[in-house]
Each structure stands twice: as C-alpha cells, then as structure tokens.
C-alpha cells in the first residue's frame, strides 16, 4: 500500500466539491488538505459522501485539531457531526447558540443521542447557566429535555416553552419536576376554554394542588385513571367522594381495580365508608360509621 500514499497527479483537491465522492479512501487521505477541509466544512453537508469517506474527513480534522475543533469548524460540521463520539465532543468549547442550533438541526427528528446530550452539557457548562434562549432552543428540539433538568433549573423555563411539550415527554418527570412545571403550564394555557385546557394541562397534573383538582371536578372533564394515578397523593387526599366522582366521570369505575395502589388506597382510608358505598363499586377500607376523624396534622399546627 506504500505506493498509494502519494496523491496521484492532477487529483490534488483545490476545493471541497462533489468530485471528491469519486475518490477512494486512500485518495481522499492523500489529496485533501485538512486546512482546506476546515475552511470549507459548510460544503460537506450538500455532498453525499459515504460513511467510509466521512471517516477519512473526520480523521483529517482530528489530526489538524488534536485538542478539539474550533467553533468556526464545529458550526459547519453538518452531518459529519453524526460521526463524532462523546469523547470528541468533550474536547469542544461551544458558546454560540447558532452553533448549538446547527448541530441539533442535524439530529432533528431522532431521539437524543449520547452525542447530543454531551453537546448540550458542554454548551450549558460553557455558558454557566441555562438562560431563556438556550431553554427555548432545547425544548423546541427536545421537549423531553425538561425532565432531565433539576427543579432549580426548571424554574427558569419560560411558560412559552411549555407549548412544545407532548404528553410522552413528561413520562420521566418526577413529582418535584412537575411541581415546578405545572404552574407554568397553567399560565401558558390559561386563555384556553375548558375542554381544550384540560387536554393540554392533563399531562402536567402530577404537580397540581388540591384546589385546582377541586376546580376541575366542577368542569365535567372525565379524567382517565392513568392521569388520576399520577396525581400527588397529598393533593388527592382532601378530595371528597363526590368531587372524585365528578372528576373521573364515567372512569370512576376504574377505582375498584386500583384500590390497593396509591393514591387511591390512601384516599379510600380517608373517606367515610358510607360515602364510598354511594359509588356502588364495593370499595372497602373507609372510615366506619360513627367514628370521629381527627386531623392530627391540623392539631399539630394549632399547638
């Protein structure tokens, strides 16, 4: 293979263009100058290089920038970004939101890859904080990114970003995160009418307080059991049997199947058995007739 290391006569690349797709791997290695590639990276995205050819181009950039690519190159990587490893990306210093957007665009429509996660981490660390513009960008590309943020970080999420969130994007959010996101969702959707509002707010209800659940029970929303089971236990406990019946509508029958699971189990324990019996579902475990219910938490607060 020694004779193949020199660039054949007349094949030296003067610019990055489509003629290079006809080069063999060794010809690309021998005939493309890394500095030329770095200055004309923006052209690569329009040209259909094979994966093997992209490997060669990446190798050339790696040799030129062993400590990590400069942002001027990173911004124009295009689909060559898909060839980068998290280890490569950890060497980068990305500070421009335009660079972040350009690379997120390359991965658009796909799940967040380890490369993208590393890129975002590098970007946020470089900026020192999650400012509104960054969050707007990240939630636009990855609404599910919200659930990877701490409650403290979520506090700076603008309500406008909530519009991009799909129900499945909140699947991995824990109650502490929903506590922060729910008021923002409530604000974002406040001008919608009853049924439309419920459709949008439904996936955020794991952060809703009791008073909001009571209000929803007056609006014939027919909450499904899956949503009910994700509500905060402390928000469900004060609801009366009548309020839960109104909240769930025809789905109230599903309580029987969930009577051993929180929050239904804990809620049943707080209700009078007489009231539970009015549902006709055979729910057991309520407070027997004639017993006095003392709210010890209220008593402690008073003493």
């Amino acid at each position: 293979e020694v004779e193949k290391t020199a660039c054949p006569s007349g094949k030296k690349a003067r610019e990055i263009d489509e003629s290079l797709i006809f080069y063999k791997k060794w010809e690309l290695e021998a005939c493309v100058d890394a500095a030329l590639l770095a200055t004309q990276m923006d052209r690569v995205n329009a040209i259909p290089f094979t994966y093997e050819q992209l490997d060669v181009l990446k190798h050339k950039l790696d040799e030129l920038y062993p400590q990590g690519y400069p942002e001027s190159v990173i911004q124009h990587l295009g689909y060559l970004f898909l060839k980068m490893s998290p280890e490569d990306i950890r060497k980068w210093n990305v500070t421009s939101l335009e660079t972040l957007k350009a690379l997120l665009e390359v991965n658009k429509g796909h799940e967040m890859s380890p490369q993208v996660a590393t890129l975002i981490d590098r970007f946020v660390k470089g900026r020192g904080q999650l400012d509104k513009d960054t969050l707007d960008t990240l939630t636009a590309f990855y609404p599910g990114y919200l659930c990877s943020l701490s409650p403290e970080e979520l506090s700076s999420v603008p309500p406008s970003s909530i519009w991009a969130v799909r129900p499945q994007d909140l699947d991995t959010c824990d109650p502490r995160q929903l506590d922060v996101l729910y008021p923002k969702a409530r604000l974002a959707f406040q001008n919608m009418n009853g049924s439309e509002y419920f459709v949008k707010i439904q996936s955020f209800l794991g952060g809703a307080p009791t008073e909001d659940l009571k209000a929803l029970s007056q609006q014939n929303v027919s909450m499904d059991l899956a949503t009910f089971m994700k509500l905060r236990t402390d928000a469900v406990l004060p609801l009366t049997v009548a309020e839960v019946q109104k909240l769930l509508g025809p789905h109230v029958e599903g309580l029987k199947a969930e009577e051993r699971h929180r929050p239904v189990r804990d809620w049943i324990l707080r209700q009078r058995q007489d009231d539970l019996d009015t549902l006709g579902l055979g729910l057991q475990g309520g407070i027997p007739n004639g017993y006095l219910v003392l709210d010890l938490s209220m008593q402690e607060a008073l003493s």
Epitope: N45, P48, Y79
Partner: nanobody, 112 residues
Framework: QVQLVESGGGLVQPGGSLRLSCAAS????????MAWFRQAPGKGLEAVAS????????IYADFVKGRFTISRDNSKNTLYLQMNSLRPEDTAVYYC?????WGQGTQVTVSS
C-alpha cells in the same frame, strides 16, 4: 428531511438498457448534490455519477463514461440514470443520494 425512492431496476441481458428513477420529496433539492452510487455483492459503495442541482455540473466515474447518463426533471423533483450497453460487472444495488439522505436502493442484474 428528504425522502428518496428509487425504481426501475431489474434483470437485463448484457448490452441491454435500463432507466433508473429517484423520486425526491420533502425539502427542496436546490442546495444539494445528487448522485447515483452502486454496491456490487461483496464490494464497497462506489459513486457512479453526480449532478449539482443548482449548477447543473455533471460528473461520471470512469467505468461508466459514454454508457450512463445522469439527468433530472426539476418539475417532478426526480433524478434519472439512463444505463446503456450494460455489462455483467454492472450488477449491483443502485442507490440515489442527496447530501446526507439516501434511498433504499434498487437491484440491477445484468445476466444472460
């Protein structure tokens, strides 16, 4: 996103002809170079011909010069490859590509 769908492959005798089509949908193609690649059994991908959608520049691999013609129809957003004087060594899966986007390929078999 760009979706590319090739068609027109098949079985043909040596010396025969075929015309491959590649229908593109999604985003506009003006900013892309489009090309035909092929992969013979047990071999790597190789570029056959390319066309720069904006400038119209055509390039052919040496092994198809004078036999194959690449063309496009802007109104139909379609790329073509007219293959004449086909040889057994042209047997391969032919792929259409535009920038980072690739089609699924169409099989061309040249055999008597």
């Amino acid at each position: 996103q760009v979706q590319l769908v090739e068609s027109g492959g098949g079985l043909v005798q040596p010396g025969g002809s075929l015309r491959l089509s590649c229908a593109a949908s999604g985003r506009t193609l003006e900013s892309y170079v489009m090309a035909w690649f092929r992969q013979a059994p047990g071999k790597g991908l190789e570029a056959v011909a390319s066309i720069n959608w904006s400038s119209g520049r055509l390039i052919y691999a040496d092994f198809v010069k004078g036999r194959f013609t690449i063309s496009r129809d802007n109104s139909k957003n379609t790329l073509y490859l007219q293959m004449n004087s086909l040889r057994p060594e042209d047997t391969a899966v032919y792929y259409c590509a535009a920038g980072r986007y690739w089609g699924q390929g169409t099989q061309v078999t040249v055999s008597s």
